[in-house]
Each structure stands twice: as C-alpha cells, then as structure tokens.
C-alpha cells in the first residue's frame, strides 16, 4: 500500500489522513465563491479568479504557484450587433426573430457580462434560404438524407438538434454536405427529463435556455493559429485563412421555444422514422423549406461574432516530491466557464481546490509525496482545450520524460446516480482498489463501498461483478496529455442513470441556468457526491504520487487489446470477399497482442518479486510502467490528425467526445463499401493493421527484461 520515506505521518495513515481532511462543506463554500459572476475565458473576471486561486493555493501550502499565460484565438459576439435568426417573408421583412439572450435566472438579473448564446468561432455571415432538418447531424443522419432520401443540403440552412455527438462534428458534417448555415437547438427529447420541472423549479431546460459551445474541429491542435507550438510572446501565427479547425459557415444555437417556431412550418419530406422525431409539437418534417402556406418564407441568419487573439491564464501549482521530484503526477481542470459554471467547470474546480487544501495541510504537518504533484487550473477549455494544450506544448519535453499520470477534474457531477470513470487500462486496478476503500454516498448503500454501489448500478458489460470503465475520448483537458503525449490519464465524476435518462449530458449544460443554486437545490444539497468525487480524484492522485511501485497493471492493457483486436476484426469481416481479394490479414495484430499478453504477464510476476529496497531497480521497473503508455504513441500521428498520436485510442472521427479503439484501422474501414477506389482503400486498411501490430509489439518489448 501507500508509503513514503519522507513523512512524519505513519505510512499506512497517509491516504487516510488525506481523505479525512476533505470536507463537503468546504467544496460547497468554494463552489459558491467560484460561481457568483461569469468567468468567460479572456475576460478580466477570469484573470482575477486566476489570481485568487494562485493566492489561495499558496496559502494552502504549495511550494510554488505560477500563472502561465498565452495569447490564443478566442471568439466573442459583437456587443452592439447581436446574433439572431429570422423568419423572413417574401418582402424580406422579419416576421419572427430568435432570442437575443436567455431570460436571466432569479437572483442574477443585474449581473453584467453574461455572454449571450453563440457558437464560438462561427464566421460572420447573413445567409438566407430554405431549412432542412437533419436530426442530430451525425454522419449516419446525412447518409440517410443524401443516400436514402435523396435530399440535397447544398445551399440550404440546416437545423440540427444537439446531442449524441460533439457539436463540432455536426458542423463539419453540415459543411461537407454543402450547407450554407447551421442552426443548433436543444430538443426536449434530449434536454427535458419527464416528470421534472424546468429551472428555477427543477433541473430541466426551459424553452428559452440555450447551450453555448465551440464548433471547432481542432483534432488536438490547441490554439488554431499556433498548432504544435505554444502561443507565447514570440510565436509565429498563421493567417486566419490557414487557422486550424475553423468552421466555414455561420452557426448559431437556439432554445426549443425558438426551434418550435422554425420547425412547425417545415414541409417537404416526412421524417424517415421515429428516431428522427423529438418531443416538440411539430411534425419533424425534413424539408427542404416550409409547407404550402409558408412556402415563400425563408430563414435568415445574422451572425456578427469576431475572432480575437486574447490573453489567457493557467494557474500551475507545484508540490515537490521528496524522493522522485522529477516524476510528475498532474491534477488539472479548467476554470473558464460560459456563464456561471455551476456544474461546468466549477463543480470540478471546487473539488480541486479542496484537494489542494488537503494536500497542503499534510505538507504543513511535514509530509511530502514521493513524486511531484502538479495542480492546474486551465483557461479557455471551452474554446477548444486551449490552456491545457498550450501549456503541454510549451512543456512537452519535460512531460514526455517525466509525466507519470494526468487526472482530469472538470465537472464533478452530471447527475447523482452513480460513479462514472473513463481511464487508461493501466489505471483499472487502481480505480477498483480505491473505490473498494471508499464509502458509497448512495441511498440504499449505507455502510457499503463505492465499488459495490457503482458495480450494482453500472455493471461492466464484459466482466461480472465489476463496474463499467469507459475509454477516454476527448472534449476535455486530458486530450493533449493522453492522445498527443501518451501520459496515462483518467477522469471520474458522478453521473445520471443512462438507462432511464436518455437525454444528452445534463439539461442545463452551458446555459445561463447552470448556477450554484442548480447544484445546491437539485443535484447535491449535502455535497456528498462532490465529496466522493474528491475522494476518487484525490485518492488516485495520492496513490499515483505516493506508492512505491506505480499502481499500474499492464495485464489489463493486454485484456483490452485482445478485445479491441477482436472488435476491429469482426468489423472487417463484414467484407469477407474483399478481405480475400486484397489479402487482408489480421494475423500480425493478433500475434502482437499475444506477445504483449505474455510479456505483460511475465513483467507482472517480476514486479511482485523484485527487490524494492534497491532504488535503481525500483526506478527501472517504475519507468517501464510509466513509459508503457508512451510506447503506444506513433510520432507520425493518425492520418490527417497529426496531434492524435495514440495508436490504441483516439477521439472518434464522427464524435470527438467518444473514444475509438484502433482508430487508424477503424477509420480506414469506415464506409469502405462506398470508396471509389477499393484497391487503394483496402491498401490503407492493410497499412493501418501494420502500424497497429508494430506499435503493440514495440510496446510489448518495452516490458521485456532490459537485458
């Protein structure tokens, strides 16, 4: 278990002392403090909060706390020229206009600087035309429209409902379909749970509530003007035409009241099936255009937002390790919010604050972790993970040599049903062991472990008696650490019951109604779920920083590699004739996975038996564990996605939020039956199998005996 030479606290009590110091009341107090005004990236208010956090982390006892600033591309609405969408008649008169701002929640009416709903990085434009309803604007939705229904979106304004996939993927898909504008809206089917009142009477989305968010397709690039390098004082910036990931057509988000006004007039084709119908009182006709009586009316977008290079500030706190100060365990979460950030991010930031306070208390009593712990309050996450990515770009050489693990700390809650964990397989055993030691906060599980309630409520689909742990995707600040640098990463939060609540995320996500009161009244009045998340995140950091042998189990990677190989093989086997014709074989991949499994097993045996009192051997074994994740990095990156370099995992090309396994092979196989040159397409499949097999074999060899 945890132990450390450099402490005056009895080793077996280290973790307990840390966990006992965490208090729900403090998290509540910090959340209140962080949510009274907006903290939009690039604003004075967020700079002031950065300085406040810096000051408080110093008071808590960290060795050093610095601000790291970067000048990155951000996006804001024009204050004097608001964005909106109109229905116009044949004379060009605006007969309906969407909202200019959300009705403010009670108690916040006089707060200034609430940014109105907008799609960050939308270009300016005033397109007008017929509307086409494209469901969730997923890849498969456009396939249905274009291939099955023969509906052409070229030159049309498309309206898509939020949910299922990252909004940036929706916009990319619309662009590829030839649309000239995109309207995003929240349908009650996805953002209004039955039987719950809308805010302020409950946690549902009101008709005037709108989800903000960026619509970039950065693919891990960070600041669009400085891909690969930090946006520092001497940075060379690309011109806006060469910027990474910017959308090319105007985009704007609306609430479901305004969506009803647009959708109720829709004509054209009926929805193809019930999966295209939401919960509004409209027919969900696909279009194009409005029905008979209204056929001369059009939709017009008025988008006047501007992209501006703006200074952002990360807060980086250091607690120096006593034994291995050159090994870094990082706990990071963002600070910037769209408005008040009641859940996203401040429910996470408040937990980080309390974790820092607890570590600081132990340090003041003379304790130090074995390894260095870095704490980060990231800026501009909402604008494309910019703060974390720029810092990692600036410190990449240190991180790739010294980075042990990264634990993410965005929103602590997206519900109050059970735990949700996404992490590298290396951390499975750490998470299992930790949650067995923690008390469950759930009703009906008094006196039971968190592991027990989690397993009961969210069972693993593969292994009975174990909880579900998901793959890491993206859409949060772990991206650069895991997908680009290959640092073992994980995240944990409390979530909803996905069985009964099919809406996407939580209803008030990125709206003005994401307030302190939302959390305190409806989600976690006792802050017991926040405390549990603090214990999980903090406990993981503690173990990673303090255990003599790193708490990574390489055998768990072997198990998932076999599962992923089986999955991708079965996808490929949907084309048996082509596999035969083009001599496609997965033998090399299965062979590499078998080798990995055997070598990992032997490594684990050696790990049990080696002399832990020999610091050189200990360091050698720990380095093999630390560098295993790194070994899955391909320096050339994935095709057309140079900053996604992990061969085993990448964000899905169709949904940034989701993780895909063997993404190179998966993307090569995707829709392969429609490729114009099958020989070339299957050649790319073969190349990707080769890359994957080589990478798995090379990673296995890093676990072999060194001589």
């Amino acid at each position: 278990k945890s132990s450390n030479e450099a402490t005056n606290i009895t080793p077996k009590h280290n973790m307990k002392a840390f966990l006992d110091e965490l208090k729900a009341e403090n998290i509540k107090k910090f959340l209140y403090n962080f949510t009274q005004i907006p903290h939009l990236a690039g604003t004075e208010q967020n700079f002031q909060l950065a300085k406040q956090i810096q000051s408080q982390w110093k008071e808590f006892g960290l060795d050093s706390v610095e601000l790291a600033h970067y000048d990155v591309l951000l996006s804001y609405p024009n204050k004097t020229h608001p964005n909106y969408i109109s229905i116009i008649n044949e004379d060009g008169n605006e007969i309906f206009n969407t909202s200019l701002f959300e009705p403010p929640p009670p108690g916040y009416e006089n707060v200034s600087d609430i940014v109105p709903p907008f799609s960050a990085f939308s270009p300016q434009g005033m397109p007008e035309g017929d509307l086409v309803y494209v469901n969730y604007a997923r890849t498969e939705d456009f396939f249905k429209l274009e291939r099955d229904m023969k509906i052409n979106c070229s030159g049309k304004i498309v309206i898509a409902r939020y949910g299922k996939v990252f909004r940036g993927n929706k916009v990319k898909n619309a662009q590829l379909a030839g649309a000239k504008g995109v309207i995003l809206y929240s349908d009650p089917a996805d953002y209004f749970a039955p039987g719950v009142k809308s805010y302020p009477d409950g946690w549902n989305l009101p008709g005037g509530g709108v989800q903000r968010g960026n619509i970039l397709n950065l693919n891990g690039a960070g600041d669009p003007l400085t891909p690969g390098y930090p946006a520092n004082e001497y940075a060379y910036r690309r011109g806006i035409a060469e910027a990474v990931g910017l959308p090319s057509i105007p985009v704007h988000p609306i609430g479901y009241y305004d969506a009803q006004k647009l959708l109720e007039k829709m004509g054209g084709s009926a929805p193809p099936d019930s999966s295209w119908r939401g919960s509004l009182k409209v027919p969900y006709n696909v279009g194009p255009g409005f029905t008979g009586n209204f056929s001369t009316q059009k939709v017009k977008m008025h988008i006047h937002s501007t992209n501006e290079v703006t200074r952002i500030y990360n807060v980086i706190g250091t607690l120096r390790g006593a034994v291995e100060p050159d090994r870094y365990v990082i706990l990071g979460g963002h600070r910037d919010s769209w408005v008040f950030g009641g859940i996203d991010p401040q429910s996470g930031a408040a937990v980080v604050h309390e974790i820092v306070r607890s570590f600081g208390t132990l340090k003041k009593e003379g304790w130090r972790p074995r390894r260095t712990i870095l704490f980060a309050s990231w800026d501009a996450e909402e604008f494309g993970l910019l703060g974390s990515t720029e810092w990692a770009e600036e410190n990449s050489r240190l991180l790739q040599e010294r980075g042990v693990a990264y634990i993410n700390a965005d929103s602590s809650i997206e519900g109050n049903y059970t735990l949700r964990v996404d992490c590298t397989p290396l951390m499975y055993s750490l998470v299992h062991n930790l949650t067995k030691e923690l008390k469950s906060p759930d009703e009906g599980f008094e006196g039971k472990s968190l592991y027990e309630s989690w397993t009961k409520k969210s069972p693993s689909p593969e292994f009975s008696g174990m909880p579900r742990i998901s793959k890491l995707g993206s859409g949060n600040d772990f991206e650069v650490f895991f997908q680009r640098l290959g640092i073992a990463s994980g995240r944990a939060r409390y979530t909803k019951n996905w069985e009964t609540n099919k809406f996407s995320g939580y209803p008030l996500y990125h709206s003005v109604y994401e307030t302190y009161e939302l959390v305190e009244k409806f989600y976690d009045p006792m802050f017991k779920y926040h405390l549990t998340v603090a214990q999980v995140r903090g406990g993981m950091v503690f173990e990673l920083a303090n255990s003599i042998v790193l708490p990574f189990d390489c055998r768990d990677y072997a198990v998932v590699l076999r599962k992923y190989a089986d999955k991708i093989y079965s996808i490929s086997m949907k084309h048996p004739q082509e596999m035969k014709t083009y001599s496609v074989s997965f033998d090399s991949l299965f062979s590499a996975v078998k080798n990995f499994t055997e070598i990992a097993s032997k490594f684990s045996e050696r790990l049990q038996d080696f002399d832990k009192s020999n610091p050189i051997v200990l360091r050698m074994m720990n380095d093999q564990l630390m560098f295993l994740e790194r070994a899955f990095i391909d320096p050339l990156g994935l095709p057309d996605r140079p900053f996604y370099r992990h061969v085993i995992y990448a964000p899905s090309s169709h949904n940034k939020y989701a993780g895909e396994s063997f993404p190179g092979i998966y993307d090569a196989l995707f829709d392969i039956e429609s490729k114009v040159d099958p020989s070339k397409a299957w050649g790319e499949v073969k190349r990707q199998i080769y890359v994957a097999a080589f990478t798995v074999q090379a990673a296995a060899e890093t676990l072999s005996e060194v001589a």
């Epitope: 909106y84 007969i95 309906f96 206009n97 969407t98 909202s99 200019l100 701002f101 009705p103 403010p104 009670p106 009416e109 809308s198 009101p206 008709g207 005037g208 609430g255 009241y257 305004d258 006004k261 109720e264 007039k265 009182k281 409209v282 027919p283 009586n293 209204f294």
Partner: antibody, heavy 120, light 107 residues
Framework: QVQLVESGGGVVQPGRSLRLSCAAS????????MNWVRQAPGKGLEWVAI????????YYADSVKGRFTISRDISKNTLYLQMNSLRAEDTAVYYC?????????????WGQGTTVTVSS | SYELMQPPSVSVSPGQTARITCSGD??????AYWYQQKPGQAPVLVIY???ERPSGIPVRFSGSSSGTTVTLTITGVQAEDEADYYC??????????FGTGTKVTVL
Amino acid sequence: QVQLVESGGGVVQPGRSLRLSCAASGFTFSSYNMNWVRQAPGKGLEWVAIIYYDGSNKYYADSVKGRFTISRDISKNTLYLQMNSLRAEDTAVYYCARERGRDYYGMDVWGQGTTVTVSS
Amino acid sequence: SYELMQPPSVSVSPGQTARITCSGDALPKQYAYWYQQKPGQAPVLVIYKDSERPSGIPVRFSGSSSGTTVTLTITGVQAEDEADYYCQSADSSGTYVFGTGTKVTVL
C-alpha cells in the same frame, strides 16, 4: 408579491388616442413576455398584443394592427399600450398579463384590468 | 383569421365530470392553455402546455390533447368551479387567440 396594475383607461371619443400603462412589481420584468388582453362588455377574452422579454418580437391581433403599439420601459418596470384611431369596438376591459419568456407556461399573472370606453 | 371553437355552455351536477373541448386547426402543432374566469375577476390559468397544472390548481383539473382538439376535464366538479373557461393557443404567425369561451354551470 407579484403584481400587475393597469392604469390609463377612461372615456375617449372615436378617432382619438389613449395610452394604457401596466406597472409590474415582485418579479423580474425583463424575463417575461408581456401581453395585453381585452374583454368587451359581456363578451369573451380577446388577445391584443405581445412584446417579448428581450424586445426581439412584437405581435398584434389583426383587429388592432397599425393602430396600437405595445412597448415597455425596463427601467420603470412598466408596459404600455398606445392606442390610436380608437373605435367603438375597442371598448373593453384591458388586462395586462405576463408569461415566462420563450416558454410554455401561459399567462400566469394578470392585472385587475382598466376600462376603456370609446364613445362620442 | 384563426379561430378556436368551444361549446357555449356545459352543465354538470356536483361530483360529476365536466369536459370542455376546444378545436382548432393549429392545435396539433401548438400548445393549448386553459383559463378560468369568474364574474368581475381577471382570468386564472388552470392548465398550461396542454396538460400541465400550475401549482395551487386543484388536481381535479386536467388537460389532454388529441389532433385538432384539446380537452379540459374537471373531475368531481364543485360549486366553486362554476365560471367561464377559455382555451388559448397560438398560430404559426406568432399571434395568440382565445377560444369562444364555455360557461360551466354547476346544477
């Protein structure tokens, strides 16, 4: 407590003008759409006009379009109805009523009404 | 212009169920609202969004919707329920309209 109080009614000759006011208190005026609804003697309710909470839309019943104008002063928490070219058929009790902005909660708070009589 | 049609009157004995209908072409695409108005008083909202009941409204009031017709049901009518009832909805041009009104008499 939440309250709407109409004023400005009275007797006016056909063709003349009148301005009604509705003073709001006890709630955030800027978060609510505001309506004028009228009721002629012995008749049913007739919707007259709406102004959205953010000022983005104003709509009128066909019977008053071009003659009546709805407006508001956020700083004074007051809704107005400017009535020009009044006709005998505009004689009614005029109510102001609020509804939560861009939502489906209906007109949940009404004033007590002010009477307008158009007569020569 | 768009109309919402209601029966002029409904009579019901105490404890019985009263049903008031409201018909309009736009109702499949528009939510309906019901208001109760007693003599000399301002209207009171009793049902919103077809079938939702505001706080403070007795559970005996309920609403339903089917095609071009919405219905207000008063289950177990009481003497104080005697009043005029109006449905209200919108049309696709953004304007609102009230129904013709129904006088409920409790026998």
